[in-house]
Interface confidence: low
């Protein structure tokens, strides 16, 4: 899928738009809101009934180079007694984000936008099990 | 910036770090992933900390539609299907990168923008602050 052009008729292309070669787009990777910080409840990954761990993935040819992935610690959920209850399931919650991928072909470098699915955390659900004959 | 290994045979002029502005192919890799969380799973209904999904639309952004989660209850759903206020439903938030049209309304010129989205909710043991 290509980036959609502005579809609304009241959006006229301004004269100030930079010239861009066909099939590509200009991307400024100086991030807006770069210093914004997540203000999640403290230690929710440990306090959750579906706790998770974090793993940092690193790729120097990706921007941003660091992507944090969550992994559910248990298949079941933690009950009030602190034991794993396997009649419930810890499941990953995922969210898409964009990254810029740098590709090297010989000495030339190109850039590609890529959608990455990030596991953000886990939640406890009642299972749906499709059993088979 | 990010330092990258370079082919030793290439000219030295190449910047090791990502340049501030890049020309990017219009095709997005992995573009076919399902962006509607309601279609990809029903966790939002089956969770012990269920949430509602709210559509956030902005034509100046790519993706133009982002779904925001809002926890339905302060507590969590127990085995009897009732809300248990000894536990808390809390949002799981994530910073994601999107494209913002810059200058505004331009079809092929963007800037990366970091936004904070609530992706879903999880059930946690509350932190009880005792007061003197």
């Amino acid at each position: 899928r290509k980036i959609p052009k502005v579809g609304h008729t009241f959006f006229q292309k301004p004269e100030s738009c930079p010239p861009v070669p066909g099939g590509s787009m200009k991307l400024d990777i100086g991030i807006i809101n770069e210093n914004q910080r997540v203000s999640m409840s403290r230690n929710i990954e440990s306090r959750s009934t579906s706790p998770w761990n974090y793993t940092v993935t690193w790729d120097p040819n990706r921007y941003p180079s660091e992507v944090v992935q969550a992994q559910c610690r248990n298949l079941g959920c933690i009950n009030a007694q602190g034991k794993e209850d396997i009649s419930m399931n810890s499941v990953p919650i995922q969210q898409e984000t964009l990254v810029v991928r740098r590709k090297h072909q010989g000495c030339s470098v190109s850039f590609q936008l890529e959608k990455v699915l990030v596991t953000v955390g886990c939640t406890c659900v009642t299972p749906v099990i499709h059993h088979v004959q | 910036g990010i330092t990258i290994p370079r082919n030793p045979g290439c000219p030295n002029s190449e910047d090791k770090n990502f340049p501030r502005t890049v020309m990017v192919n219009l095709n997005i890799h992995n573009r076919n992933t399902n962006t509607n969380p309601k279609r990809s799973s029903d966790y939002y209904n089956r969770s012990t900390s269920p949430w509602n999904l709210h559509r956030n639309e902005d034509p100046e952004r790519y993706p133009s539609v982002i779904w925001e989660a809002k926890c339905r209850h302060l507590g969590c759903i127990n085995a009897d299907g009732n809300v248990d206020y000894h536990m808390n439903s809390v949002p799981i938030q994530q910073e994601i990168l999107v494209l913002r049209r810059e200058p505004p309304h331009c079809p092929n010129s963007f800037r990366l923008e970091k936004i904070l989205v609530s992706v879903g909710c999880t059930c946690v043991t509350p932190i009880v602050h005792h007061v003197a």
Partner: nanobody, 118 residues
Amino acid sequence: ESGGGSVQAGGSLRLSCAASGYTYRSYCMGWFRQAPGKEREGVAAMNSDGTTTYTDSVKGRFTISKDSAKNTLYLQMNSLKPEDTAMYYCAILDGYCYRPIRTGYHDRGQGTQVTVSS
């Protein structure tokens, strides 16, 4: 489930399981087993992206695989040991398995018996 039977220690069996009805983008198919008087135990699982996970006691001996065209899940069991004797079940759940399924639900298929004698 099918493919169970009686076999001598060191022998092999291949279990198969015909599955249908799952529509989730992300799902996990797996095998679990239960020996009389013992807790249910996850054996092996395979996620929709092809990643597999095994319980420690079967690593290197059992292989989980699937034939997407036939919607069939397999468990190739080699170098069988008497402690592998159990009723084997397969199940599918939505989500991702970081460890083999050991579902707590009793709503399941009939299972297939595997008996390994020394």
